[in-house]
C-alpha cells in the first residue's frame, strides 16, 4: 500500500546553473494524497531558511504529481543561493531538500559558459 | 525486475577512446543519480562521478575531472561514461550504480565492465 | 576530500562469529538535513558492489536482519551478529555527504 504522507521531491544536493536577466521557475514536485497541502519556499541564509514573502509563485498539475513553482521574473544576481520548500500537513511541517541555484552575471562572463563549467567554476558564481 | 546492464568488456590500446553504456530499467532513471566507479585490479573502490538523468547536470572527482564525461539519455534510460586518451593505468573495471536522488531508497549496481588497456 | 578509514583492512572469523567493522571519517558526515549519508557495501569476489546499509542504519531491501549499522558524526560501524557462510566478502563504507564522494579501503572478511 503506497503511502500517504506528503512527499516533497527535490533531490539532495541538486542543483541549476541559470544566468541572470533570463526567466526561470523553480519547481517543488508535491506528491499527496486527498488535501494539497500548503507549500512555501525559503531560501537559506546559514542554517537558517527564511521565507519568501510576495514573490510570484503558482501551481501546475501533472497527472501524479503537482508542482508548487516560484519564478524568477527575471533572474537576478542576488537570486544565487539554496532553497527549500515545506509543506504543511497535519499540523506537521515536511522540509524538502535544498537546491542550489548558480547564478552567472552575463555582463562579467564573455560568453556562457555550460553547466558543467559554471559548477566547477565557483569564481564565476556570485555567494 | 530492476536490472543495471552494462555493457561487455573492451579490450583498446594506449591513446583511444571508449564509451561504456549502462542501460537502466525497472525504475525511472530521472529519480535517480548514476554514480560511475572505478575499481583497479586487486584494489578497493574509487568515486569518478555522478550525472542527474533528470536535467543533465554532473559532479566529477578531481582525481577524474577532464580524463572521462559522464552523460545519460533519459529517453532511453541509459547512462555512459567516455574515457578518453586511454593508458594501460585505466585497466579497470568500471561500475554504474543509481541511488534514487530523494530519499535514498535504493541503491542499485550495473555487473561491471572490464577495461584492459593494452599495446 | 574525505578520508574513509576502516578497520581492520582484513580479519578472520568463524562461521556464527560476532564481527564489528569500523569506519571513520576524517570530518563529519552531517549533512545540513541533519543526516549522515554513509552506506555500507558487500562484494563478492568477481562481482559487483551490493549495498547493505544507507543512512548509517537503514537495511536494504532484503538484507538479513543479521547486519546492523550505527554511528555519527565521524564514527561508523558495521555489525554482523552472527557469520553465515554467504557473508565472507569485502565490505565497504563510502560517504556521500560531501564531494568528492568516497569509500573506505576495504575490510576483507575471510574464514578463520
Known amino acids: 500500500k503506497e503511502s500517504c504522507d506528503v512527499q516533497l521531491y527535490i533531490k539532495r544536493q541538486s542543483y541549476h546553473s541559470i544566468f541572470a536577466g533570463d526567466p526561470f521557475k523553480l519547481e517543488c514536485p508535491v506528491k499527496y494524497c486527498a488535501h494539497r497541502p500548503q507549500v512555501t519556499w525559503c531560501k537559506l541564509n546559514g542554517t537558517t531558511c527564511v521565507k519568501l514573502e510576495g514573490r510570484h509563485t503558482s501551481w501546475k498539475q501533472e497527472k501524479n504529481l503537482s508542482f508548487f513553482i516560484l519564478h524568477f521574473e527575471p533572474v537576478l544576481p542576488s537570486d544565487n543561493g539554496s532553497y527549500r520548500c515545506s509543506a504543511n500537513f497535519l499540523s506537521a511541517i515536511i522540509e524538502s531538500h535544498s537546491t542550489t541555484l548558480y547564478v552567472t552575471d552575463v555582463k562579467s562572463a564573455s560568453e556562457r559558459p555550460s553547466k558543467d563549467e559554471m559548477a566547477s567554476r565557483p569564481w564565476l558564481l556570485y555567494s | 525486475e530492476v536490472q543495471l546492464v552494462q555493457s561487455g568488456a573492451e579490450v583498446k590500446k594506449p591513446g583511444e577512446s571508449l564509451k561504456i553504456s549502462c542501460k537502466t530499467s525497472?525504475?525511472?532513471?530521472?529519480?535517480?543519480?548514476i554514480h560511475w566507479v572505478r575499481q583497479m585490479p586487486g584494489k578497493g573502490l574509487e568515486w569518478i562521478g555522478r550525472?542527474?538523468?533528470?536535467?543533465?547536470?554532473?559532479k566529477y572527482s578531481p582525481s577524474f575531472q577532464g580524463q572521462v564525461t559522464i552523460s545519460a539519455d533519459k529517453s532511453i534510460s541509459t547512462a555512459y561514461l567516455q574515457l578518453s586518451s586511454l593508458k594501460a593505468s585505466d585497466t579497470a573495471m568500471y561500475y554504474c550504480?543509481?541511488?534514487?536522488?530523494?530519499?535514498?531508497?535504493?541503491?542499485?549496481w550495473g555487473q561491471g565492465t572490464l577495461v584492459t588497456v593494452s599495446s | 576530500d574525505i578520508q574513509m578509514t576502516q578497520s581492520p583492512s582484513s580479519l578472520s572469523a568463524s562461521v556464527g562469529d560476532r564481527v564489528t567493522i569500523t569506519c571513520r571519517s576524517s570530518?563529519?558526515?552531517?549533512?545540513?538535513?541533519?543526516?549522515?549519508?554513509l552506506n555500507w557495501l558487500q562484494q563478492k569476489p568477481g562481482k559487483a558492489p551490493k549495498r547493505l546499509i544507507y543512512l548509517v542504519s537503514k537495511l536494504d531491501s532484503g538484507v538479513p536482519s543479521r547486519f546492523s549499522g550505527s554511528g555519527s558524526g565521524t564514527d561508523f560501524t558495521l555489525t554482523i551478529s552472527s557469520l553465515q557462510p554467504e557473508d565472507f566478502a569485502t565490505y565497504y563504507c563510502w560517504q556521500d555527504t560531501h564531494f568528492p564522494y568516497t569509500f573506505g579501503q576495504g575490510t576483507k572478511l575471510e574464514i578463520k
Open positions: 525497472g525504475f525511472n532513471i530521472k529519480d535517480t543519480y
Open positions: 570530518q563529519s558526515l552531517l549533512d545540513r538535513d541533519g543526516k549522515s549519508y
Open positions: 550525472n542527474d538523468p533528470a536535467n543533465g547536470n554532473t
Open positions: 550504480a543509481s541511488y534514487e536522488g530523494y530519499y535514498e531508497r535504493f541503491g542499485y
